[in-house]
């Protein structure tokens, strides 16, 4: 086109329905120019106008010839243009922010605007740019894009933004623009102009100077604090550490904390100082609640449920910022809240939930919540299977009879629908405890009763009880212990009895042992001893306990002696023993040696012995009657170990084995023995009976049994040349090759002739006795042989 004609035709649209086309007027034309615009399309349309732009309906795809005639005072000129949608620019109208508001407590800006979508013929994607600026100098803080869709009608859009800096700290400005990304439009698409700016600023009050106030934030976060001040701020500190100041408008300043550390329970202090003042706030840096750990629900009484949990990682937030817990039961919709005053015991928290009638299965959700977040744990529980009974109380023991008692106790709760398994601990003094399990039907009134049999009469028992439900979850704690003495019963056995004839053979001495407590069945008060023959029964006077011996004058006829023990309830069965022994001519005295503490005696089985065997023992050196103690063993035994605290090593004891038939005893074996053999304590006394020029006859005496201290096994006789009171070596000293030793193993030998000696020579003689326990001391003598004749 010529310069003298209309030129530079451009078309724009803001709604895709109308194109706004404008051109530049020919140079030199004034105001009074008219234009004729003709558009060559299906119907040839021409428009008369007095300005350099025209709004035309959007043309469909394809090229169109546009003719513009300019009619002015000094003639006319015509320009032809080819117009295509691709030459048209889509520039949306400048958007307008309808509303900008702020929530200062969360430092959040809220934006509201209209997309004016009703003017667009079809759906289009819209890109919005939102610009946030801060401070009077309008520093760009954030530029964000936000996508929406036009849907043929006007739509209100909302957008919010959380500021990293409290909104109180500085003025904040917001402006928006848009870009319509229409798929149906092939022309150039451009951004709208920026909307008129809107701002938010804080109206300072007289008090608060530092923001944010009392904020709770996550450990590791970044946070900005500011101080609104009329006077110059000199410094800022978090805790005791200084922070560089960021200058805002006027005297206002800010600081930025990166990766904040966990706070103490009193929070972290943030302060700003001026010449004369300090302004501060407290920040609480902590953690959201951890998932409650080990959530467990149980009941003590089937009336209320106790749920316990561990809070897990500490949040570092206390007081009003501490974690609050709510326990919700989803079947019933009921819930209970944890009161902060209920301080956790040993790091574990607990809540009580009232049980609901006819509900056994509970679905609990424990919600944990603090200002930084929430978490939860769930548990599904059949509460009848999670009964942890209270400790049984009011535990009592009452007698039924001498072998049975009645136990009663109190177990709070309504257990009518379940069974209990209770464990009773039964402890007898000085013996191991026994435990018995009993199943008991639960009751509503909390009182329980059980009978306990198979006890021993007159025995001190200590009882205690604990219970669990039959399905077993947990044992209750043990009840208090109750000590109880069962009542007496008739003694179950007669005393263990023996008899000995007195040394003069005129009196029979009857001995018996006190009944063990489990056979006495009570306190033994006395004993009855009676003596019967075919003709008569003679009863001695009652012998009070603790006397365990009676003496009867008897002839040598055979009598049956009976001993009966009596307690407050009655008399024992009689213990019977014949006064006379069944003779046995075929007896040798045997030697036996023990094993340090006791002595093992063995014998052959004898079917004739029908009652029992008795082993009797005594100290060999004691006078008659020989009785130190006796032991009864069953008739089917063939060995026993005899042990006694009275046994001493090196002391000789007599042991007698008796067999019994029809209450009569026959001596089967007679033994002498030692628990342990020792070496003799003395040497044999010896003398020289005869001396010649070449021999000496020595004679010695027996060592008394008490000093022998074992079975004599032989003598050691040493001899060699030697003189009294000289420096010459003694016979027993080592290294002498001329010493001769004789081992005399025939213990009946009491003399020894030493031959082949030299005449008129001094000899040193030494004699020692030995047992299996060792060699005894020496006895020595010096003898001079006669002169050769």
């Amino acid at each position: 086109q010529k310069k003298g004609a209309p030129h530079d035709l451009k078309c724009v649209t803001n709604n895709l329905q109308v194109w706004d086309c404008y051109w530049k007027a020919p140079s030199g034309t004034g105001r009074g120019t008219d234009y004729e615009v003709c558009i060559e399309n299906r119907s040839h349309s021409c428009y008369q106008l007095e300005k350099t732009n025209i709004k035309i309906p959007a043309l469909s795809h394809g090229d169109y010839e546009i003719t513009i005639n300019s009619l002015h005072d000094f003639g006319s000129s015509t320009s032809k243009f080819t117009l295509n949608e691709q030459n048209v620019s889509l520039i949306p109208d400048t958007p307008e922010i309808l509303n900008l508001s702020a929530d200062f407590s969360t430092s959040t800006l809220y934006l509201k605007w209209n997309d004016r979508g009703s003017v667009f013929p079809h759906h289009s994607n819209v890109i919005w740019e939102i610009k946030i600026l801060r401070k009077e100098s309008m520093e760009l803080v954030k530029l964000v894009t936000h996508n929406t869709t036009l849907n043929g009608k006007d739509t209100l859009h909302h957008w919010s933004w959380a500021s990293d800096m409290p909104l109180e700290c500085a003025i904040h400005f917001v402006e928006i623009r848009c870009y319509i990304d229409s798929l149906h439009f092939s022309g150039r698409k451009e951004w709208s102009d920026w909307s008129p700016v809107k701002n938010i600023s804080w109206m300072p009050d007289s008090q608060t100077k530092v923001f944010p106030q009392d904020k709770v934030i996550l450990v590791g976060s970044d946070i900005t604090f500011c101080c609104i001040s009329q006077e110059k701020v000199l410094s800022a500190l978090i805790g005791h550490t200084n922070c560089p100041l960021i200058h805002l408008d006027g005297e206002n300043v800010a600081i930025k904390i990166h990766n904040i550390s966990v706070s103490a329970s009193s929070g972290t202090n943030v302060v700003f100082t001026t010449e004369d003042n300090i302004f501060g706030t407290v920040i609480f840096a902590g953690y959201p609640p951890d998932t409650p750990q080990q959530l467990n629900c149980e009941t003590h009484d089937l009336k209320e449920i106790l749920c316990r949990w561990n809070p897990g990682r500490a949040t570092a937030l206390v007081g009003p910022r501490a974690t609050s817990y709510t326990l919700l039961e989803s079947f019933s919709g009921k819930y209970v809240r944890f009161k902060r005053a209920e301080a956790p015991t040993n790091g574990s928290y607990q809540l009580f939930f009232q049980m609901l009638p006819n509900q056994e299965i509970y679905n609990f959700t424990l919600n944990a919540h603090n200002p930084l977040g929430r978490s939860e744990s769930t548990i599904l529980v059949n509460i009848t299977e999670k009964v942890y009974p209270h400790t049984p109380t009011s535990f009592k023991v009452k007698d039924i009879n001498s072998t049975a008692v009645k136990l009663s106790w109190h177990l709070p709760g309504n257990f009518a629908k379940i069974n209990f398994l209770c464990q009773i601990e039964i402890k007898k003094s000085n013996t191991v405890q026994e435990q018995r399990n009993v199943t008991i039907k639960g009751v509503e009134n909390s009182s329980y009763l059980v009978a306990l049999d198979k006890l021993n009469p007159y025995t001190v028992y200590t009882f205690r009880i604990r219970c669990s439900t039959e399905t077993f979850w947990k044992w209750s704690k043990w009840s208090n212990k109750k000590q109880h003495l069962t009542t007496e019963a008739i003694p179950s056995k007669g005393p263990d009895t023996w008899r000995e004839w007195s040394s003069d053979g005129k009196n029979l001495i009857i001995y018996w042992k006190p009944l063990p407590i489990n056979e006495a069945n009570g306190k033994i008060l006395s004993y009855n001893v009676s003596c019967s023959s075919d003709e008569e029964t003679q009863s001695l006077s009652e012998i009070p306990d603790p006397q365990h011996k009676a003496e009867i004058q008897l002839d040598k006829n055979d009598y049956i002696i009976s001993v009966v023990a009596k307690n407050s309830v009655g008399s024992s069965p009689p213990s019977k023993i014949a006064s006379m022994e069944i003779p046995n001519d075929d007896l040798k005295i045997e030697q036996v040696v023990g094993m340090g503490k006791g002595i093992l005696l063995t014998w052959h089985y004898d079917p004739n012995m029908t009652c029992d065997y008795v082993i009797k023992w005594c100290n060999s050196s004691r006078s008659e009657p020989c009785l130190m103690d006796w032991r009864k063993v069953p008739s089917n035994s063939t060995e026993t170990v005899i042990e006694s605290d009275q046994f001493r090593p090196g002391v000789r004891y007599n042991f007698f084995l008796y067999g019994c038939r029809n209450q009569g005893y026959q001596l089967l074996r007679s033994m002498i023995g030692y628990i342990e053999e020792l070496a003799p304590t003395v040497a044999p006394n010896f003398t020289v009976e005869d001396t010649s020029a070449d021999s000496i006859l020595v004679k010695w005496e027996d060592i008394p049994v008490e000093e022998l201290r074992g079975f004599l096994r032989g003598y050691l006789f040493y001899f060699g040349k030697g003189e009294r009171d000289t420096s010459k070596m003694r016979v027993l000293e080592s290294g002498r090759s001329d010493i001769k030793v004789k081992n005399i193993t025939d213990i009946s030998q009491k003399t020894l002739r030493i031959a082949d000696l030299q005449g008129k020579t001094s000899y040193h003689l030494v004699l020692r006795a030995y047992t299996d326990g060792g060699v005894g001391p020496e006895k020595s003598m010096y003898v001079v042989t006669k002169e050769n004749s």
């Epitope: 410094s235 550490t241 009193s266 100082t273």
Partner: antibody, heavy 116, light 107 residues
Framework: QVQLVESGGGVVQPGRSLRLSCAAS????????MHWVRQAPGKGLEWVAV????????YYADSVKGRFAISRDNSKNTLYLQMNSLRAEDTAIFYC?????????WGRGTLVTVSS | DIQMTQSPSTLSASVGDRVTITCRAS??????LAWYQQKPGKAPNLLMY???NLESGVPSRFSGSGSGTEFTLTITSLQPDDFASYYC?????????FGGGTKVEIK
């Protein structure tokens, strides 16, 4: 470990000068305001001077104003106190302490004796 | 300058006693008060700041209270390690000023 160690104390005549140093270790020295506090023998604590974390501000007690100068070298993690025109009443243990407002870490002190 | 007055200057007490030390400011200092402990021959040690905040590592038997001009330091159950001198300090404005000190000694 975190510590402050003072040095430079000693016996000096009245009217003379002395320079105290305080070496910091185990923490970010440049993030803390630093003080000098003194304690005359058998007496209480007396604040002497403070310097801002970046050295931008300094304040002094009236008793030392014009005679003492506090300074710091953050690159060397060191605090200084230049003491001029010393007087007998300046005799004290001088402590350096960390923290602009509250002193949460103290050195063991260095004794300055002003005596003729 | 803000003057700090501490009382008593000396206090005799036994292990297990509850001990209270008072500090007064000549003008309001809000809560900008610290307490220090000093043992003979040693440097002071920070116990409490902002009147009632316990410094990390300080036993919980120490507590502080007060605001404005009246402040107290309390030791609930005196331990052998607590026999020392105690100083209050205001840090509301420069110059920082200390109280005259309270010596807690064994009765």
């Amino acid at each position: 470990q975190v510590q402050l160690v003072e040095s430079g104390g000693g016996v000096v005549q009245p009217g003379r000068s002395l320079r105290l140093s305080c070496a910091a270790s185990g923490f970010t020295f440049s993030s803390y305001g630093m003080h000098w506090v003194r304690q005359a023998p058998g007496k209480g604590l007396e604040w002497v001077a403070v310097i801002w974390f970046d050295g931008s501000l300094k304040y002094y007690a009236d008793s030392v104003k014009g005679r003492f100068a506090i300074s710091r070298d953050n690159s060397k993690n060191t605090l200084y106190l230049q003491m001029n025109s010393l007087r007998a009443e300046d005799t004290a243990i001088f402590y350096c302490a960390r923290g602009q407002l509250v002193q949460d870490l103290w050195g063991r002190g260095t004794l300055v004796t002003v005596s003729s | 300058d803000i003057q700090m007055t501490q009382s008593p200057s000396t206090l005799s007490a036994s292990v297990g006693d509850r001990v209270t030390i008072t500090c007064r400011a000549s003008q309001s200092i809000s809560s900008w008060l610290a307490w220090y402990q000093q043992k003979p021959g040693k440097a002071p040690n920070l116990l409490m700041y902002k009147a009632s905040n316990l410094e990390s590592g300080v036993p919980s038997r120490f507590s502080g209270s007060g605001s404005g001009t009246e402040f107290t330091l309390t030791i609930t159950s005196l331990q052998p390690d607590d026999f020392a001198s105690y100083y209050c300090q205001q840090y509301k404005s420069n110059p920082l000023t200390f109280g005259g000190g309270t010596k807690v000694e064994i009765k």
